[in-house]
Amino acid sequence: CSCAPTHPQTAFCNSDLVIRAKFMGSPEIIETTLYQRYEIKMTKMLKGFDAVGNATGFRFAYTPAMESLCGYVHKSQNRSEEFLIAGRLRNGNLHITACSFLVPWHNLSPAQQKAFVKTYSAGCGVCTVFPCSAIPCKLESDSHCLWTDQILMGSEKGYQSDHFACLPRNPDLCTWQYLGVSMTRSLPLAKAEA
């Protein structure tokens, strides 16, 4: 199973559900569906209110039962640790894979935490984080923001990932915007070719 690097904003926008939750124990196999099921305790819903409707929370997260099908393995034994889970909604159930954006909440930067709660949503459906994995790369649209962490930092966990969101500057233009105290600062050369 191989997963493409994902900016947290892309993970947020491409997911049906984004929640904060704790994993309550070992998985069990559902014998009819051949999926693994983790019991979880949802503490906060950050995205998915419309999709979920009247559901008050999710008790389980489902994942394929084999590694080759990108099944997720939860390694932490700490039941009090809170995780950010960005997943898909299928038949009313939360589904995750090894490629899901699923990280301990405390591992996110304060800027990312803030963005998952309220900022990333402003870019969904309007702006696109465009990964630049090899030079040269250029933007295909004014609604794209060039994501260069992989080239500049050698990792998907870089400055843009930790501190910036791709947000509309005006109806026809998206730019990197700093997730700090001021939301007006743009990343220099955000629209330039790398």
Epitope: S26, I29, E31, T32, T33, L34, Y35, Q36, P64, A65, M66, E67, S68, L69, G71, V73
Partner: antibody, heavy 117, light 110 residues
Framework: QVQLVESGGGLVQPGGSLRLSCAAS????????MSWVRQAPGKGLEWVSA????????YYADSVKGRFTISRDNSKNTLYLQMNSLRAEDTAVYYC??????????WGQGTLVTVSS | DIALTQPASVSGSPGQSITISCTGT?????????VSWYQQHPGKAPKLMIY???NRPSGVSNRFSGSKSGNTASLTISGLQAEDEADYYC??????????FGGGTKLTVL
């Protein structure tokens, strides 16, 4: 009572194809995951493939991945195994069983597949 | 081949108890309570004897019992009878390989 009856085995040349069937009766077929397990002559059991009750999820052993395809027709209560690019080492008795990765509570009588030139 | 480790053969006299071990790893036997045991007589299909480590399907004699400690599962047959002579296979769920069987143990009743 639960019954599983395999068919479709036989002699096939290396590189050839064969389709096995397993007719199920005596239980609500769509409510159960199903598997194929094989046993080479004089050898032990080897899990081959499994499919969920709806047919939406399929799993394969590394030894057959890309060559074999498991499927089911819940309207006909039938499980299938399409075997392509057959090799000598695929020679075995093939059993269909009720259950996915474990707890296979009912088995068919098996059908012999011989891959030889 | 990936397989759980079982002794090739065990033997016992009628009335005795025998135990067959099945050793895996933390990815299969040790990681899940999904261990099954099967009995297979020559020329016949396997029969489920124990499921989920220690549970007996209805119709299986209570002389058969299963247990697990760490990465090793065990099948114990007490009050050995002639009809118990057969091959026995353990099986476990494995996240990487889906399902893995043991190599099989031939039980001889002396």
């Amino acid at each position: 009572q639960v019954q599983l009856v395999e068919s479709g085995g036989g002699l096939v040349q290396p590189g050839g194809s064969l389709r096995l069937s397993c007719a199920a009766s005596g239980f609500t077929f769509s409510s159960y995951a199903m598997s194929w397990v094989r046993q080479a002559p004089g050898k032990g059991l080897e899990w081959v493939s499994a499919i969920s009750g709806s047919g939406g999820s399929t799993y394969y052993a590394d030894s057959v991945k890309g060559r074999f395809t498991i499927s089911r027709d819940n309207s006909k209560n039938t499980l299938y195994l399409q075997m392509n690019s057959l090799r000598a080492e695929d020679t075995a008795v093939y059993y269909c069983a009720r259950g996915g990765f474990f707890n296979m509570d009912y088995w068919g009588q098996g059908t012999l597949v011989t891959v030889s030139s | 081949d990936i397989a759980l480790t079982q002794p090739a053969s065990v033997s016992g006299s009628p009335g005795q108890s025998i135990t067959i071990s099945c050793t895996g790893t933390s990815s299969d036997v040790g990681g899940y309570n999904y261990v099954s045991w099967y009995q297979q007589h020559p020329g016949k299909a396997p029969k489920l004897m124990i499921y989920d480590v220690s549970n007996r399907p209805s119709g299986v004699s209570n002389r058969f019992s299963g247990s697990k400690s760490g990465n090793t599962a065990s099948l114990t047959i007490s009050g050995l009878q002639a009809e118990d002579e057969a091959d026995y296979y353990c099986q476990s769920y494995d996240f990487t390989y889906g399902s893995v069987f043991g190599g099989g143990t031939k039980l001889t009743v002396l």
